[in-house]
Interface confidence: medium
């Protein structure tokens, strides 16, 4: 049956539809397309005949419209007046008509919306605000977007007027946000800018910091005050019901007894025209001075410096003590205390000596804290480390390599490409890349305190060609029942697959077999004999794929029992005895052979020319492997019986 | 398929310059670093430098600085080297060449196509 | 600049046997996993060919019988079993930093 399909079905103004034919029948004479949904000669587009490909604009021709010997319209530059049916009348040879009709619907490119708001500074647990976006257009769908997640669901959440408004009803603090319009119709979806919600709220009951309240004379008093506000708080402070002064912080340096008494913060929001206020008492104890440390270097070097930090002031018949880490001292050959405790020797300082380090004075009553000293150590650069770890890259995608080196101070960095510098930058960024930024890419790390550099070279490979692939092991020969190995397959590739066979199959299903790492890694748990097999990683993507050399797993095992031959137990007297002993190990294991519990030789068989009764006993076949570490052993009787005594017995070897 | 065609022979006097051609076919010019080599009679290959088609960027060996000078026409897909106060010592034959497009690679500078080579005699 | 040194600076072997070239570079040519050496074949009056990349890589089309080793700064090309064909002149060449190559090696049969 003819029909037509319209690609698309919903067309964007200034864009272009085809209307496509759907079996067109044979031996045709030609085929006319009509606006609208009948065959009407006022409404004719374009007729085309077949027998000239000659092509007739009709009095709906447009000049946008252009006709395909298969039958199929495209209508270009799409105007909204297009929308609606359009009928093809097919007239075929035997002048028989048949006919078809198809539709498109056209709708505008949405316009980028905005926001509109009645209230640009809401009071919290007072106002409603009601965004609006704009501008009304017919045909869209609204949405809102709160922080770029879809709206919550709200009871203070109120959608109207065609979901075009947003009302955010008793707004809170936790309404500040970011908020979004988006419109959509069947061609476009366009989102406004961020709407950020400014809701006034506060002063809530300040806070007084630290929350410390007792201080020895000679001490700093340093109150700080918080309150949360929009906009932020106005502090006053006042002591014992005296005003001070109007900052959020209150320092009295070198205080005594006298700053003892009641301390007041007030905090007021001269939008909400709010106060609150919160007292707290402060205590000022007579003390004796505080220790401080003092260091003989403040930038010591790493693996190279000693540090002497010494707790001062000098005070006769009186105990020093340390800390460090807030931690005390740990047992080290490399921390030394003076006789009289107050000084401290760090030898050969590391980056973690860093501390902090505290000293104290003990007396009667307590314990003096200095403040704590942290030490610069100067160390590195490491090796720098390139990341990312991919060596393969497609052509066209941008390259971005960041190399960090651990150092104090930081290192300085610079970029090299097969020698030549670049930049002096931690990060090297190349866009769409082609095979010739394949290369040596050096990171050099300079530590400028030190004077010391370290550098990566790393190698990058642009190809839309992968390459041939190769297995890494951790483990080359895993014993059985005991090791895990993990193949990896290299190199590391961006966007590409990876893939196993075994043996020259896909991996089996196994509970022992597992992918990882994005299928790079194939780790076999608990490796059996039966793992020996021929292991392929194959890489692929869009443009190419690669397969690796097998690489075969050779897996340590047994001994196993041994097996003694031949079965017999029974000799004649004067025949050969050739015992043979075999165990399944990997690789071969040792033999040594026992006649009641006497060592023998260290061969695999074991040969006793012309056998007498005297050779009756237990024989014992010992093996051992030294790879897996196992030893085995199999014991068997061996009855020789004087010449013809006994019927049935074995005529030896 | 991928060859580079390289021009004739030429014979120049002491103290005068000559120029090269190299002209690329079976492949973009643009996407690969086009190299240049020397090899006087009966010695070993010396590498001249490279020239990135794309934007002209070039490298020379120390040797060559001042010597040669490389240049490219991408519309010919055609590379150019002009050798300037010629001497008895420049004569040699000198190669261009590059990275072919069947190779895996993992840097730049290995040489798989290679021109027939151009033989230049410096001679009064 | 990276010195390549090539031995010997002639070899002749007889059909069938085998040929060891050796290129030692004054600085490592090895990084990141990979050996920044190469090996050319130059017939009279030819230009050179790819024989092998980095270090060990066959370059397609060229028989098996050719074969390189080596990382760091000592390298080898290998004839397995020397045919008439293989009389030429051989080159290393290295990538490491800008390129150079070797002196050569020319291979006769005895």
């Known amino acids: 049956k003819l029909t037509i399909e319209s690609t698309p079905f919903n067309v964007a103004e200034g864009k272009e539809v085809l209307l496509l034919v759907h079996n067109l029948p044979q031996h045709l004479f030609g085929y006319s397309w009509y606006k609208g949904e009948r065959v009407d000669g006022n409404r004719q587009i374009i007729g085309y005949v077949i027998g000239t490909q000659q092509a007739t604009p009709g009095p709906a021709y447009s000049g946008r419209e252009i006709i395909y010997p298969n039958a199929s319209l495209l209508i270009q530059n799409i105007i909204q007046n297009d929308t609606g049916f359009y009928t093809l009348h097919v007239i075929k040879s035997d002048l028989v008509n048949e006919e078809a009709t198809g539709q498109f619907r056209v709708y505008p490119e949405l316009p980028k919306p905005s926001i509109s708001s009645n209230n640009s500074k809401p009071v919290e647990d007072k106002d409603a605000v009601a965004f609006t976006c704009e501008p009304e257009t017919q045909d869209a769908t609204y949405l809102w977007w709160v922080n770029n997640q879809s709206l919550p669901v709200s009871p203070r959440l109120q959608l109207s007027n065609g979901n075009r408004t947003l009302t955010l009803f008793n707004v809170t603090r936790n309404d500040t946000a970011s908020y979004k319009c988006e419109t959509q119709n069947p061609v476009s979806a366009r989102r406004s800018d961020s709407v950020i919600l400014n809701v006034l709220y506060g002063p809530d009951a300040p806070t007084i910091s630290p929350l410390n309240t007792s201080y020895r004379s000679g001490e700093n008093l340093n109150l700080s005050c918080h309150a949360a506000s929009n906009p932020p708080a106005q502090y006053s402070w006042f002591v014992n019901g005296t005003f001070q002064q109007s900052t959020q912080e209150l320092f009295i340096p070198n205080i005594t007894v006298n700053n003892s008494g009641s301390y007041t913060c007030q905090a007021h929001n001269s939008d909400t025209g709010l106060n609150r206020t919160t007292v707290t008492t402060i205590t000022v104890y007579a003390e004796p001075p505080k220790p401080f440390i003092t260091s003989n270097n403040s930038n010591p070097v790493e693996d190279e410096d000693a540090v002497a930090l010494t707790c001062e002031p000098e005070i006769q018949n009186t105990t020093y003590l340390w800390w460090v880490n807030n931690q005390s001292l740990p047992v080290s050959p490399r921390l030394q205390l003076s006789n009289d405790n107050r000084t401290l020797t760090l030898l050969s300082v590391t980056r973690n000596d860093v501390g902090p380090y505290e000293c104290g004075i003990q007396n009667e009553l307590s314990v003096d804290h200095s403040d704590p000293v942290i030490l610069n150590v100067l160390y590195g650069p490491d090796d720098p480390t390139i990341s990312p770890s991919y060596t393969y890259y497609r052509p066209g995608v941008n390259l971005s390599l960041s190399c960090h080196a651990a150092s104090n101070p930081p290192a300085q960095y610079s970029w090299l490409i097969d020698g030549n510098i670049q930049q002096h930058t931690q990060e090297l960024f190349i866009s769409n890349i082609t095979e010739k930024n394949s290369g040596l890419y050096t990171c050099q790390a300079n530590n400028s305190a030190s004077g010391h550099s370290r550098t990566t070279v790393k190698t990058i490979t642009v190809s839309a060609e992968l390459p041939k692939p190769s297995i890494s092991s951790n483990n080359s020969k895993p014993v059985e029942d005991k090791d895990a190995v993990a193949f990896t397959c290299e190199p590391e590739a961006q966007n590409t697959t990876y893939l196993w066979w075994v043996n020259g199959q896909s991996l089996p299903v196994s509970p022992r077999l597992q992918l990882s790492n994005g299928n790079r890694t194939l780790t076999l748990f608990n490796v059996t004999r039966n793992d020996a097999r021929a292991y392929v990683c194959g890489i692929q993507n869009s443009v190419s794929a690669n397969r690796s050399d097998p690489v075969t797993l050779d897996v340590l095992y047994g001994p196993d029992t041994p097996i003694i031959s031949p079965p017999d137990s029974s000799y004649l007297s004067g025949a050969n005895l050739n015992l043979s002993c075999h165990s399944a190990s990997n690789p071969s294991p040792q033999y040594s052979w026992r006649i009641n519990g006497i060592p023998q030789q260290h061969t695999q068989v074991l040969f006793i020319a012309k056998i007498t009764p005297n050779n009756n006993g237990t024989y014992a076949c010992f093996v051992s492997n030294l790879a897996t570490g196992r030893n085995n052993s199999i014991v068997k009787s061996i009855t020789v019986s004087a010449s013809g005594t006994s019927p049935g017995l074995s005529a030896g070897a | 398929e991928v060859q580079l065609v390289q021009s004739g022979a030429e014979v120049v006097k002491p103290g005068a310059s000559v120029k090269m051609s190299c002209k690329a076919s079976?492949?973009?010019?643009?996407?690969?670093?086009m190299h240049w080599v020397k090899q006087a009679p009966g010695q070993g290959l010396e590498w001249i430098g490279w020239?990135?088609?794309?934007?002209?960027?070039?490298e020379y060996a120390p040797k060559f600085q001042g010597k040669a000078t490389m240049t490219t026409d991408t519309s010919t897909s055609t590379a150019y080297l002009e050798l300037s106060s010629l001497r008895s010592e420049d004569t040699a034959v000198y190669y261009c060449n590059t990275r072919g497009l069947s190779t895996m690679i993992t840097t730049r500078w290995f040489f798989d196509v290679w021109g027939a080579g151009t033989l230049v005699t410096v001679s009064s | 600049d990276i010195v390549l040194t090539q031995s010997p600076a002639s070899l002749a072997v007889s059909l069938g046997e085998r040929a060891t070239i050796n290129c030692r570079a004054s600085?490592?040519?090895?990084?990141?996993?990979?050996?920044?050496m190469h090996w050319y074949q130059q017939k009279p009056g030819q230009p050179p060919k790819l024989l092998i990349y980095l270090a060990s890589n066959l370059q397609s089309g060229v028989p098996a019988r050719f074969s390189g080793s080596g990382s760091g700064t000592d390298f080898t090309l290998t004839i397995s079993s020397v045919q008439a064909e293989d009389v030429a002149t051989y080159y290393c060449?290295?990538?490491?930093?800008?390129?150079?190559f070797g002196g050569g090696t020319k291979l006769e049969i005895k």
């Open positions: 060449q290295h990538s490491r930093e800008l390129p150079t």
């Open positions: 020239i990135d088609p794309e934007n002209g960027d070039t």
């Open positions: 079976g492949f973009n010019i643009k996407d690969y670093y």
């Open positions: 600085k490592s040519v090895s990084a990141s996993g990979y050996s920044y």
